[in-house]
Interface confidence: medium
């Protein structure tokens, strides 16, 4: 059993990675029909991973701690936000000794409900179901659940069919504050204004592996390319720069966040939609000079160092956008606010 006593976010992330492995890897105890299917995690909009503390046999579970991550518009996972769980009832009442939980948030509205409110009650407006198990194909009729939330519980190392309806995920503000060294809301952590901490690399490694598994199973709908095209053509936040404790992370934080009503809205500079008519390919190549170094965040990004001269292939009217450029034979997109016109 994983330690459920609320601790710091670093150990929570480590614990979460361990739990997720236990829920998804085929072992002598977990046969191929006793794991969370890759596509469930690959398609999830959010994921909560917790361990639960129980006062004793036949006694209601008292609560638990863990983390939640959200899927960003570009397909990557957000930084982790610390959470607790309360109001555990259901199967717990009859003595099922649940140790670890994985909660799959299938829809954006489930993630947003938690991020905006700081807590999320399972059930009611958000339908909850025990999540499907096994390496079933995604199209399997039995798996076509419309539930907003899937729950996976383990009891004594085995899956237990407990839906967790009526229990509540709670934002742990103090844990987040201590880890991120600032007062920060779950919304800003989960919706991409916060860097993925290096301490959670284990967790991201296993999360990213599900996307690969899912794609390898022939279920790919070229999500990466679509995300990249969306990022180029629609309003989306620029990559930020280091904000707090850069030694903890190579990815940075952005301060200029905008409207919160829609995850895909332009988060850096609200109200800039009029700037986003594409100028398209340029007749005369424009050269820009990099003010700051930019390390690409995903394939298709253009890496450059401060001082590099980039040939712009296509641009918008706004400096607060992604442009396309060419450097040393490589073509890719880059944040225009990192460069200056020559």
């Amino acid at each position: 059993m994983n330690n459920p006593i609320p601790s710091n976010l670093k150990s929570e992330a480590k614990k979460a990675a361990k739990i997720l492995r236990e829920f998804t890897e085929i072992t002598s105890r977990n046969g191929p029909d006793k794991i969370i299917p890759a596509h469930v995690i690959a398609k999830a909009k959010g994921l909560a991973i917790l361990s639960v503390i129980k006062a004793g046999f036949l006694v209601t579970a008292r609560g638990g701690s863990g983390i939640v991550v959200a899927r960003l518009p570009d397909g990557k996972w957000s930084a982790p936000s610390a959470i607790g769980i309360a109001g555990l009832g259901g199967g717990f009442e009859i003595g099922i000794e649940v140790s670890d939980l994985v909660i799959i948030l299938n829809y954006d509205r489930a993630v947003e409900a938690f991020a905006k409110g700081g807590n999320l009650t399972l059930g009611g407006n958000l339908t909850v179901a025990v999540g499907p198990l096994g390496r079933n194909l995604e199209g399997n009729v039995a798996l076509r659940s419309s539930a907003a939330v899937f729950t996976y519980c383990k009891s004594r190392g085995l899956f237990a069919g407990v839906s967790l309806e009526g229990s509540c995920l709670i934002e742990r503000k103090e844990t987040n504050r201590k880890f991120y060294c600032q007062d920060i809301r779950a919304y800003d952590i989960l919706f991409g204004d916060t860097p993925r901490p290096a301490q959670a690399e284990d967790l991201y490694e296993i999360l990213d592996s599900f996307t690969e598994k899912y794609e390898n199973e022939g279920q790919r709908i070229n999500a990466r390319k679509a995300a990249r095209e969306q990022r180029k053509s629609s309003a989306k936040e620029l990559p930020p720069k280091p904000l707090s404790r850069p030694q903890q992370s190579s990815a940075p934080v952005q301060l200029n966040s905008g409207s919160q009503s829609n995850r895909n809205e332009y988060k850096l500079y609200p109200g800039l939609s009029s700037y986003h008519e594409r100028v398209g390919n340029l007749n005369q190549p424009i050269e820009v000079t990099a003010l700051y170094s930019f390390e690409g965040q995903q394939p298709g990004d253009l890496n450059f160092q401060a001082g590099d001269r980039i040939t712009v292939i296509s641009k918008t009217d706004s400096h607060f956008d992604w442009w396309e450029g060419k450097l040393r034979g490589q073509t890719g997109i880059f944040p225009a606010n990192y460069v200056t016109m020559n």
């Epitope: 904000l243 301060l255 966040s257």
Partner: antibody
Framework: EVQLVESGGGLVQPGGSLRLSCAAS????????MSWVRQAPGKGLEWVSA????????YYADSVKGRFTISRDNSKNTLYLQMNSLRAEDTAVYYC????????????WGQGTLVTVSS | DIQMTQSPSSLSASVGDRVTITCRAS??????LNWYQQKPGKAPKLLIY???RLQSGVPSRFSGSGSGTDFTLTISSLQPEDFATYYC?????????FGQGTKVEIK
């Protein structure tokens, strides 16, 4: 013309409170993070607090954490700094500053407002 | 927190002199370094950003250089209006910190 005008400074007793305002004009206020920077008499510049464009994220220097609250009203193009439990060492000229391009630098500064904490 | 150390803390120079101010960061900050000028009773004014980029409207006699931990502000030919206090500031990580300032006085 891009302009920032601070107000609300004055004399206050230790333990007292004060609210500073910064009226912005000449740029789309909600698009930019804003910051407060202070300067004690005869001393250097010290960053105090910052707030994101939407107001959803706030940041504080350790010296003011828990006592000062930064906020903004984008409909009024105004930045605020609520200062509670004031101490003698908070005596300074307080400047508001506009942060350009993802907090790369402070490109526009107000003229400053003097806060004196003394009994 | 990243500490910024300027040297010298003050200097005396004459009009036409070449003046150099240095700023050292306690850890590498790449080129996330800005320079400000402040005159008595006035607000600071941005001179240089990204270590070497001249802010619009600032005379070309001001220049900046450096990367990593060591940075320099140079005034190629000191003018009467340049007598002021100069501050470096890192924008690499929060809290954003300033150097203690360098006062340039008339010799």
């Amino acid at each position: 013309e891009v302009q920032l005008v601070e107000s609300g400074g004055g004399l206050v007793q230790p333990g007292g409170s004060l609210r500073l305002s910064c009226a912005a004009s000449g740029f789309t206020f909600s698009n930019y993070a804003m910051s407060w920077v202070r300067q004690a008499p005869g001393k250097g510049l010290e960053w105090v607090s910052a707030i994101s464009g939407s107001g959803s994220s706030t940041y504080y220097a350790d010296s003011v954490k828990g006592r000062f609250t930064i906020s903004r009203d984008n409909s009024k193009n105004t930045l605020y700094l609520q200062m509670n439990s004031l101490r003698a060492e908070d005596t300074a000229v307080y400047y508001c500053a506009k942060a350009e391009y993802s907090y790369l630098y402070f490109d526009i500064w107000g003229q400053g407002t003097l806060v004196t904490v003394s009994s | 927190d990243i500490q910024m150390t300027q040297s010298p803390s003050s200097l005396s120079a004459s009009v036409g002199d070449r003046v150099t101010i240095t700023c050292r960061a306690s850890q590498s900050i790449s080129n996330w370094l800005n320079w400000y000028q402040q005159k008595p009773g006035k607000a600071p004014k941005l001179l240089i950003y990204a270590a070497s980029r001249l802010q619009s409207g600032v005379p070309s006699r001001f220049s900046g250089s450096g990367s990593g931990t060591d940075f320099t502000l140079t005034i190629s030919s000191l003018q009467p209006e340049d007598f002021a206090t100069y501050y470096c500031q890192q924008s690499y990580s929060s809290p954003w910190t300033f150097g203690q300032g360098t006062k340039v006085e008339i010799k």
